[in-house]
Interface confidence: low
């Protein structure tokens, strides 16, 4: 296995998923795309949380930048060796795999959080409410309880669908960064092997 | 049509109960929350609470905690207002409203009001 | 909570005058809706959203303003224009109504 290669392809899939959470996570600030409910502060607490812009956007964009840039780097090497100045940086790659996992593990919790509150949302007597917030995420399950929030309209399916797509987002960038730690110690420790007939593609 | 018809005009004595009836019609009555506002006599409108008509919980103004109950009867879409151990400054009108929610949320549908008059 | 004080208490009016009311509030608000009431009668909604008539308002009626300073503006006066009108906000709990501004024709 080629473990540089496998990296760069780990890379390129944490910027398509760090650029999904990142609108993911900026759609919640808008219910229906009205920019009102956020002037007005009626978005639920998790939102604030900025776990898809941060922990599962701009946080994982380090270490896939990292993963990309493993493959192509020469490094200086270590005492004229390449190899063992690839070894280093697969290695450090280790590291930025676990800021990847802080960040995503970031994004999952704030996620789960979120869709367990439910949304801030007027509720069927008037009063800006956690409507869900006592069900202990049950209401996902009773989606005939979804009418007690009348506005946002739809705010429920709204913040549902987000923060279970960051949930998901987060839980493969997770996957993934803790995939490249394997794969950085074991590229770190096994030697960095590229030679054409053992290229791996991801 | 949408409407709130309240009930008649009660007179009553210091400590003694009293219940106003508001029955909605015209509109699905668990959609909308009951609001009930009371203006004294010469006085402006002071709100006092509403009543989660899906739910039937009720919620309290600062004001009205402890002899005031709202309750509902969901089967006759029905939402009450029971005043307890009466006090003379409880004379006034009553009126239960609906509340509009979607881009702006106001009052739209107010019952005619009931007048408690409590004198010994 | 947010207090809402109207102002003037009463307005004398002949027909065919402008006249503006406002309500102020202590704190900022998003909007304020504004009810009229005439004597014996429940209030009606007239204003809401700051600036929307409710349905049957004539259009010599308008609304505005932003912040703590809400105004509501009748054109040109009618005799049945003559009622006391309440501002009132749910911007903040608890929900809360102007003392009102009753307008008197001359």
């Known amino acids: 296995m080629c473990y540089g290669k496998c990296a760069r392809c780990i890379g390129h899939s944490l910027v398509g998923l760090a650029l999904l959470c990142i609108i993911a996570n900026i759609l919640l600030y808008f219910p229906n795309g009205e920019t009102k409910y956020a002037s007005e502060n009626h978005l639920s607490r998790f939102v604030w949380f900025f776990s898809g812009i941060v922990g599962g956007g701009l946080l994982m964009l380090l270490p896939a930048f990292v993963f990309i840039g493993l493959e192509q780097d020469d490094c200086c090497g270590c005492c004229g060796h390449e190899n063992c100045g690839k070894r280093c940086a697969m290695l450090s790659s280790v590291l930025a795999a676990l800021i990847g996992i802080a960040g995503s593990g970031y994004c999952v919790i704030v996620a789960a959080l979120g869709l367990a509150e439910g949304p801030l949302c007027l509720d069927s007597f008037g009063q800006w409410n956690y409507t869900f917030a006592s069900t202990e995420g049950q209401y996902l399950l009773d989606t005939s309880t979804w009418s007690q929030c009348t506005e946002p309209k739809h705010i429920v399916e709204w913040n549902v669908s987000l923060f279970s797509i960051l949930l998901a987002l987060g839980g493969i960038e997770f996957i993934l960064c803790l995939i490249q730690v394997i794969n950085g110690v074991l590229g770190g420790i096994c030697g960095f092997c590229c030679s054409r007939q053992q290229q791996y593609d991801c | 049509q949408i409407q709130l018809v309240q009930s008649g005009p009660e007179l009553k004595k210091p400590g003694e109960t009293v219940k106003i009836s508001c029955k909605a019609s015209g509109y699905t009555f668990t959609n909308y929350g009951v609001k009930w506002v009371k203006q004294a006599p010469g006085k402006d409108l002071k709100w006092m609470g509403w009543?989660?008509?899906?739910?039937?919980?009720?919620i309290y103004a600062a004001d009205f905690k402890g002899r005031f109950a709202f309750s509902l009867e969901t089967s006759a879409s029905t939402a009450f207002l029971q005043i307890n151990n009466l006090k003379n400054e409880d004379t006034a009108t009553y009126f239960c409203v609906r509340f509009q929610y979607g881009d702006y949320r106001y009052f739209d549908v107010w019952g005619a009001g009931t007048t408690v008059t409590v004198s010994s | 909570q947010i207090i809402l004080s109207q102002s003037p208490a009463i307005l004398s009016a002949s027909p065919g005058e402008k006249v503006t009311m406002t309500c102020r509030a202590n704190?900022?608000?998003?909007?304020i809706n504004w009810y009229q009431q005439k004597p014996g009668s429940s209030p009606k909604p007239w204003i809401y959203g700051t600036a929307n008539l409710a349905s049957g308002v004539p259009a010599r009626f308008g609304g505005s303003g932003s912040g703590t300073s809400y105004s509501l503006t009748i054109s040109r006066v009618e005799a049945e224009d003559a009622a006391t009108y309440y501002c009132?906000?749910?911007?903040?709990?608890?929900?809360?109504f102007g003392a009102g501004t009753k307008l008197e024709l001359r």
């Open positions: 009132q906000q749910w911007s903040s709990n608890p929900l809360t």
């Open positions: 704190s900022g608000i998003s909007f």
């Open positions: 009543i989660n008509t899906y739910t039937g919980n009720p």
